[in-house]
């Protein structure tokens, strides 16, 4: 049995397009070998119509393409302007046509809405283009060609070959007379309006010998597709308006009262404030299709959405559109989680990211939403051990606590870290969460020295001062690497003297590195946690240098450098290419976990999520 798979039967009507996906095992050989679409002949051969190596048969010129998606193990054959002649038996396959790595597809194209009492029916979507074909006889070849629209009892001239254009059609209509060989003229109307619908009459000549042809134009207003999503979840609007508007500005708008449609986002850079931080307009394909992702759905997001194309970037009469009616289900399966997490400069935040607990093995991601252009979300860290260079030593993604929640810790905060962040996985696409990090006034709770230098072969002791509010928390030291933070042994040195108005419950916990080696160089974190839930962290960079004088080093706060400030981000970090999250497969279906416990008085990182989302803390 061939491992190739596809649709056994495809049925369509004249003038339509089909998109046939063929699936193959994505082995290295298969991914790179020739893909083809061929038509089976009566004698058993199969004549190639299109292949991945660039061949296109004259029968398919200008109306078909074949695209390989090696990462998915699929290739897609798109065929437009179908006619009944396209009906037949085909094969989609890999390699050589006769080799047998193929799948049989039956394509049946039936006659579309054809001639009814000599009236040609044209059914076209609002905003699209129609071509009305008008045949004539040789004796009228040199005579005036015209198109009339029947309004009430009277035909009204729309366009003629002498240059007249009815004002209602200005800028969106033309009359084409085919070459001398073809006895046909056509009228092309763009940006169709609902008011264009009706009976038309083509005419060649003006006397009793004139040729006439009736046409019935039906302009369809798109029925809204019903979309149901959960409160706090997300929705993706896929908008395919056709290649004829590939280079026209695109928009998504939400209908308010009457015919008004308020722009939510467009490709000209406009974005409604209510969607700040939770919307992405994914770049359009060559065919002009694009998608808009909205996360953190709210009750008030429900309504009718239109996507369209117009040079103004907003809905105008004649814009081609697609429509959706979004319903937001308030009995949501997605639990509440903080929408705002607050931290102080030099401090840290721990963000809990929910995901679908069925997808524990999925790759977890955290990205920073950027509002520039159409919105994008470059990756900062993932669960596979990748961390963006500028974040090394201060960002970690931990699989804990697990069972539907992972944790992201960001420390050495500066005002530049304020913004919107998205939690994602490579699993399902309907659940994603957004959290806003706000930087507020205040001092970090944990006190550590600034950057520290250790001497090869000696002992280094690094202190971390914990205020009394953390008395019930587990205190730890760990060494940061790009897959997490590996716990290290530490000593409780008793009460700390680093805090005013703090009783015996404050603590000084030291990290001791015995016989320092080059491998000890790097970032170290001290922090607090309760079980698998992480709270505040503080980071210290330990540099290692050659021995100068014997002895061990005991670093105190006084001797240490100042706490890192915003300049840290500028010091020699190598910019690497951003990985923007524009592939919908990177979005996750996730389950959020509410966290109402305060982060130990919350002077460093508290949570404020507004309205009904108010929470006590994001980290503990």
């Amino acid at each position: 049995k061939s491992p190739i798979f596809g649709p056994e039967e495809v049925n369509s009507v004249e003038g339509n397009s089909v998109s046939i996906t063929c699936y193959y095992p994505p082995t290295s050989v298969n991914r790179h070998t020739r893909k083809y679409w061929c038509r089976q002949g009566a004698r058993g051969g199969c004549i190639t119509l299109i292949s991945s190596e660039g061949y296109v048969s004259s029968k398919y010129a200008g109306r078909a393409n074949l695209t390989n998606f090696p990462e998915n193990g699929t290739f897609v054959v798109n065929i437009a302007q179908l006619s009944q002649d396209d009906s037949g038996r085909y094969k989609c396959g890999l390699g050589i046509n006769s080799r047998g790595l193929s799948f049989d597809v039956s394509l049946e194209v039936s006659q579309g809405p054809g001639l009814l009492n000599d009236t040609k029916v044209y059914t076209v979507d609002l905003g699209r283009t129609v071509t009305i074909n008008c045949p004539f006889k040789t004796e009228n070849a040199q005579k005036r060609k015209s198109l009339y629209k029947q309004i009430g009892l009277y035909p009204v001239l729309v366009i003629d070959s002498s240059g007249y254009v009815n004002p209602n059609y200005t800028g969106r209509i033309r009359l084409d007379i085919q070459g001398t060989g073809q006895l046909l003229f056509s009228v092309v109307i763009n940006q169709l309006r609902l008011s264009d619908a009706g009976q038309y009459l083509c005419q060649a000549g003006d006397d009793s010998n004139s040729n006439k042809k009736n046409a019935d134009l039906q302009v369809l207003k798109p029925e809204p597709e019903l979309v149901y999503e959960d409160l706090r979840g997300s929705v993706t609007f896929h908008c395919a308006l056709g290649p004829e508007v590939a280079n026209v500005a695109k928009f998504l708008c939400r209908q308010s009262s009457g015919e008004n449609c308020d722009v939510v986002v467009n490709t000209l850079g406009k974005r409604a404030p209510a969607f700040e931080g939770r919307i992405l307009l994914n770049p359009q394909d060559k065919d002009g299709s694009f998608s808009v992702v909205i996360t953190g759905l709210r009750k008030e997001d429900a309504g009718r959405y239109l996507c369209g194309a117009h040079s103004d970037g907003q809905l105008q009469e004649g814009s081609p559109i697609q429509a959706w009616q979004l319903f937001v289900n308030e009995e949501s399966t997605i639990p509440r989680s903080p929408t705002v997490v607050k931290g102080v400069a030099g401090g840290s935040v721990a963000v809990l990211c929910p995901y679908n607990r069925k997808e524990s093995k999925s790759i977890k991601y955290w990205c920073l939403w950027e509002g520039a252009q159409n919105g994008r979300c470059p990756l900062l860290v993932d669960s596979e051990g990748w961390v963006k260079a500028q974040y090394e030593g201060r960002l970690s993604l931990l699989e804990e606590p697990g069972n539907g929640t992972f944790t992201v810790i960001l420390n050495q905060l500066t005002s530049r870290d304020a913004g919107f962040y998205w939690c994602l996985t490579n699993g399902d696409t309907l659940w994603r969460t957004t959290v806003e990090i706000k930087i507020i006034e205040g001092e970090p709770n944990l006190k550590v020295p600034g950057n520290v230098t250790a001497v090869l072969g000696e002992t280094l002791k690094v202190p971390c001062h914990f205020p009394c509010k953390f008395s019930s928390y587990e205190k730890y030291w760990c060494k940061w690497n790009n897959t997490g933070c590996q716990a290290l042994p530490s000593q409780d040195e008793g009460p700390s003297k680093a805090f005013v108005n703090c009783d015996e419950n404050s603590r000084l916990v030291s990290l001791t590195l015995n016989l320092v080696t080059r491998a000890d160089e790097g970032w170290y974190w001290c922090g607090v946690k309760q079980g698998h839930f992480y709270g505040e962290t503080a980071a210290v960079y330990v540099a290692v240098e050659e021995r100068k004088a014997a002895g061990s080093r005991d670093v105190s706060l006084a001797k240490a450098d100042a706490a890192p400030d915003e300049k840290v981000l500028d010091s020699g970090f190598r910019e690497i290419e951003n990985k923007a999250i524009q592939d919908p497969r990177l979005f996750a279906e996730e389950k959020a976990v509410a966290d109402t416990r305060d982060q130990a008085d919350g002077s460093r990182a508290s949570v404020d999520s507004g309205s009904s989302e108010e929470q006590g803390g994001s980290s503990r």
Partner: nanobody, 130 residues
Amino acid sequence: QVQLVESGGGLVQTGGSLRLSCAASGRTFSPYAMGWFRQAPGKEREFVAAIRWSGATTYKYVGDSVQGRFTISRDAAGNTVYLQMNSVKPEDTAVYYCAADRVPKDISIDPRNPKDWDYWGKGTLVTVSS
């Protein structure tokens, strides 16, 4: 809530025919694709057939083990799907599940993969006696 209700299952003799129906209802549900999977005792869920549509175009998919014997179709409204089972064999004995999808999936989604379907019916038992 969306509901898929299968009907038409029962006992049939080897070589005979059976027609299963699956009706989708609830939340003004309008799927983009519907399909059939089956599960025999102690075996994994197996793809049988699927039908996907976009405007006036329909795409029909059939599993290897039933090719040439089973056909899938739908009603004009697109809310009911049928599985016509001809020349049935004892190995066709299984619980037949209807599946539906309300989201037009990315081209990389393989209709044979049960994980890629949003909604499932409770199943109808088909027993083929020899």
